[in-house]
Interface confidence: medium
């Protein structure tokens, strides 16, 4: 029958060239020369020449050897003609494959390869994956099939075999126990890929395996134990670094160190942060600590770190003993701020008040006291004592000094300490209103008109304070009741002046007393400016001039 | 490497004291509390107390109060247990060990022992 | 004070044999049990501290475990120098108690 069945032909042939493969026949030569031809890429068209036919025997030629590499199979046609060109058959397939050799070695993809994996982790874990290349053939053949293997392993602790590697995949797995970041922090292993499935030719590559850092250390103290002076009252001051080391990695949330005051703190005086750099623990002051209350604080620090421990790690504890040192307190007036009632006006060297300081500090320490101040000058302070006297006249209507009856003084005490220190306090006299003002009209003059008047309504003001103020009563005196009148309102708080006579255009004096509830009295000259006018008027017309 | 060495046997009398020592080296010594451990003929271990050099503090096992008195110089790198008005009860084999931390004690570096033997 | 109670007071093991003693506190320790070796000569070395953390340069046939009261140190495969006493320890309650004592021998 005109069919070849699919040559074989290995690559890389030696020869001698042309090497026949097959004969094509074809059974119409019975009848009539037949001439063979073929076609098709690697006979007349590229790669030209790789094949060729004897023409009238039929035989199929190889003229140069094969690469699979290059080109795994040909198809190519066979022709069977006549003597005049006609074609007596069909074009028929033939098929070439060309079958491998191991002319290839493996190649890895990358030189040196790098992976990682957390120190500490369970065996069977896979780190990393390596690859390799062979260009011959992995399916009819072992000539392309790599097979991968750990040549070697730096450095060899704890032990030379920590890893392992698929022998298909080239993936890359732990095989022990005891990956330990602080003792080796990388591996490098020689990987090798050698094909016909680890029997045939090897290349090597260069395995890198980062061991990455667990938090599998504990910070701990060193040392242990600190002593620190730390002055009272002292607030955000810095009373201790605290030093922990870490074999974890620098930097890291597995070396950053996280304090806690876990005793001896109870009134909450101490805060604890950690340097940023240094990562020591800064133990500060939070309140000022108080020398006569407590003088020496112990304190029990713990620390952890940022990032939770991997496996139960126990927890390093410091301990501080903190020795307050006494500092020389300013005295402290009881109460900071007094209040003392006093009558206004009493007599000069009258006393006031006694008011004294206590001083924190536990020796007995002398006090002296001095007025720090006095706006009107009106009160003494026996050094010695504390006991205010009055040296001026208190006057709770004094508008300068005195506001809603209080006179506010400051007063110093200053102990004998080394240096000496000073506090101040706030004495509040309210003052005692006494009747030592009379009421006085507003305004005190007026223009009236001398026909039809108005009644001018005058206010009544009194300093003083009730029941020494209103109800108020008015007199006129010195003969001004002959030509004016003057009542007090239903109120009280208001006197009405009358012209009651005619007085011609003038200014006159009415003299008006006025006493208050207390019949403290007090004269006040009105001045009257009188008006030839009718009813209302605020100034005085010009002469009228007839004409 | 971090060493703690003691001084060698003792053999005294009732009633009287004897003053153990015990070297550190290797290790910064003000740091750490030192620990002293009493171990009698064919008994376990007791902890007598601990100091920590850095201080003189010191804390002790309420059962040895009065009976031990423990200190320290730090120039010289070396810890001192005395043990006093002794007694045949107080014959035993007594140990140093620098503690690892000040919670959770563990002791990592131990002293060979100091045997002491009380007989009239 | 707080009681620890070891078991066995004494064994005889083979070379090669799996070896386990076993430590009880009287209450919860936290973890806070160690463990040390007291040759004959009367050395003593830390083995294992805060229940199963190896000291720097114990071998690996060492191991700990236990949580709450209940607390063992395993040899895995004993050698000839493992023989000696060895005593548990409490660090969490002032002050620190050791166990009795086990001591291993070859048969």
């Known amino acids: 029958d005109w069919v070849v069945a699919p040559i074989s032909v290995p690559e890389n042939g030696k020869g001698p060239f042309p090497q026949r493969l097959n004969q094509l026949k074809s059974n119409k030569d019975r009848d009539t020369k037949i001439f063979y031809s073929i076609t098709g890429p690697g006979a007349d068209s590229p790669p030209e020449g790789v094949f060729a036919v004897e023409k009238e025997t039929g035989w199929l030629l190889l003229n140069k050897p094969l690469d699979r590499e290059e080109i795994a199979k040909y198809e190519l046609f066979g022709h069977a003609v006549s003597e005049n060109g006609a074609s007596v058959e069909d074009p028929m397939n033939i098929s070439i494959i060309v079958t491998d050799q191991n002319d290839h070695k493996p190649k890895f993809t990358q030189d040196t390869f790098r992976g990682s994996v957390l120190e500490g982790v369970m065996p069977g874990t896979s780190v990393m994956q390596v690859t390799a290349t062979d260009e011959d053939d992995a399916v009819n053949t072992y000539n392309g099939v790599v097979a991968y293997s750990i040549h070697s392993q730096e450095p060899k602790e704890p032990h030379d075999l920590m890893f392992t590697i698929h022998k298909s995949t080239g993936t890359i797995s732990v095989i022990s126990s005891g990956l330990d970041r602080e003792k080796v922090p990388e591996y490098r292993l020689t990987v090798q890929a050698t094909d016909m499935d680890g029997e045939g030719s090897t290349t090597t590559a260069e395995a890198v395996v980062q061991i990455l850092d667990a938090n599998d250390n504990a910070p701990e103290f060193d040392p242990q134990k600190y002593e620190a002076h730390v002055p009272e009252n002292a607030v955000g001051h810095e009373v201790q670094r605290l030093t922990v080391t870490d074999l974890d990695a620098p930097n890291s949330p597995a070396w950053r160190a996280t304090y806690l005051i876990m005793g001896g703190d109870d009134g909450d005086h101490f805060t604890i942060t950690t340097h940023p750099e240094s990562n020591q623990g800064i133990l500060t002051t939070r309140k000022g600590l108080d020398f006569e209350a407590k003088n020496q604080h112990t304190l029990y620090v713990e620390v952890t770190n940022e990032a939770p421990f991997v496996l139960k790690l126990p927890t390093s504890t410091a301990t501080i003993v903190v020795h307050v040192e006494d500092v020389n307190e300013a005295p402290v007036f009881v109460p900071p701020s007094k209040v003392v009632e006093v009558q206004e006006g009493i007599p000069t060297g009258e006393p006031v008040c006694v008011y004294t300081a206590e001083d924190p500090d536990k020796e007995n320490q002398k006090i002296s006291y001095r007025i720090l101040r006095d706006p009107a000058g009106w009160l003494a302070m026996d050094p010695d004592s504390g006991q205010v006297t009055a040296v001026g006249t208190l006057d709770r209507e004094d508008e300068q000094f005195v506001r809603n009856n209080i006179y506010e003084v400051m007063v110093l005490a200053m102990d004998n300490g080394s240096p000496p220190t000073t506090g101040t306090g706030t004495l509040l006299l309210t003052l005692i209103d006494v009747n030592d003002h009379g009421p006085v009209p507003e305004p005190r003059q007026i223009t009236i008109c001398n026909q039809s008047p108005v009644r001018q309504v005058l206010n009544i003001t009194d300093k003083d304070l009730s029941p020494h103020t209103s109800p108020f009563q008015a007199q006129l005196t010195d003969d001004s009741d002959i030509y004016w009148t003057a009542e007090v309102n239903e109120e009280g708080d208001t006197v009405v002046l009358s012209l009651k006579k005619f007085l011609k255009q003038d200014t006159y004096d009415v003299h008006l007393s006025l006493s208050d509830h207390g019949n403290k009295e007090q004269l006040t000259v009105i001045r009257a400016t009188v008006c030839d006018c009718h009813g209302h008027v605020e100034t005085c017309p010009g002469p009228w001039k007839g004409g | 490497v971090q060493l703690v060495e003691q001084s060698g046997a003792e053999v005294v009398k009732p009633g009287a004291s004897v003053k153990i020592t015990c070297k550190a080296s290797g290790y910064a010594f003000s740091s750490y509390w030192m620990n002293w451990v009493r171990q009698r003929p064919g008994k376990g271990l007791e902890w007598i107390g601990h100091?920590?050099?850095?201080?003189?503090?010191?804390n002790y096992n309420g059962k040895f109060k009065g009976k031990v008195t423990l200190t320290a110089d730090k120039s010289s790198n070396t810890a001192y247990m005395q043990l006093s008005d002794l007694t045949p009860e107080d014959s035993a084999v007594y140990f140093c060990?620098?503690?690892?931390?000040?919670?959770?004690?563990?002791?990592?570096?131990w002293g060979q022992g100091t045997t002491v033997t009380v007989s009239s | 004070e707080l009681v620890m109670t070891q078991t066995p007071s004494s064994l005889s093991a083979s070379l090669g044999d799996r070896v386990t003693i076993s430590c009880r506190a009287s209450?919860?320790?936290?973890?806070?049990l160690n463990w040390y070796q007291q040759k004959p000569d009367g050395t003593v070395k830390l083995l294992i501290y805060?229940?199963?953390r190896l000291h720097s340069g114990v071998p690996s046939r060492f191991s700990g475990s236990g949580s709450g009261t209940d607390y063992s140190l395993t040899i895995s495969n004993l050698e000839q120098e493992d023989i000696a006493t060895y005593f548990c320890?409490?660090?969490?309650?002032?002050?620190?108690?050791f166990g009795g004592g086990t001591k291993l021998e070859i048969k």
């Open positions: 209450q919860d320790i936290s973890n806070y």
């Open positions: 060990a620098r503690d690892r931390g000040s919670f959770g004690a563990w002791f990592a570096y």
């Open positions: 320890q409490q660090g969490n309650r002032n002050p620190p108690t």
């Open positions: 100091i920590y050099p850095g201080d003189g503090d010191t």
């Open positions: 805060y229940t199963s």
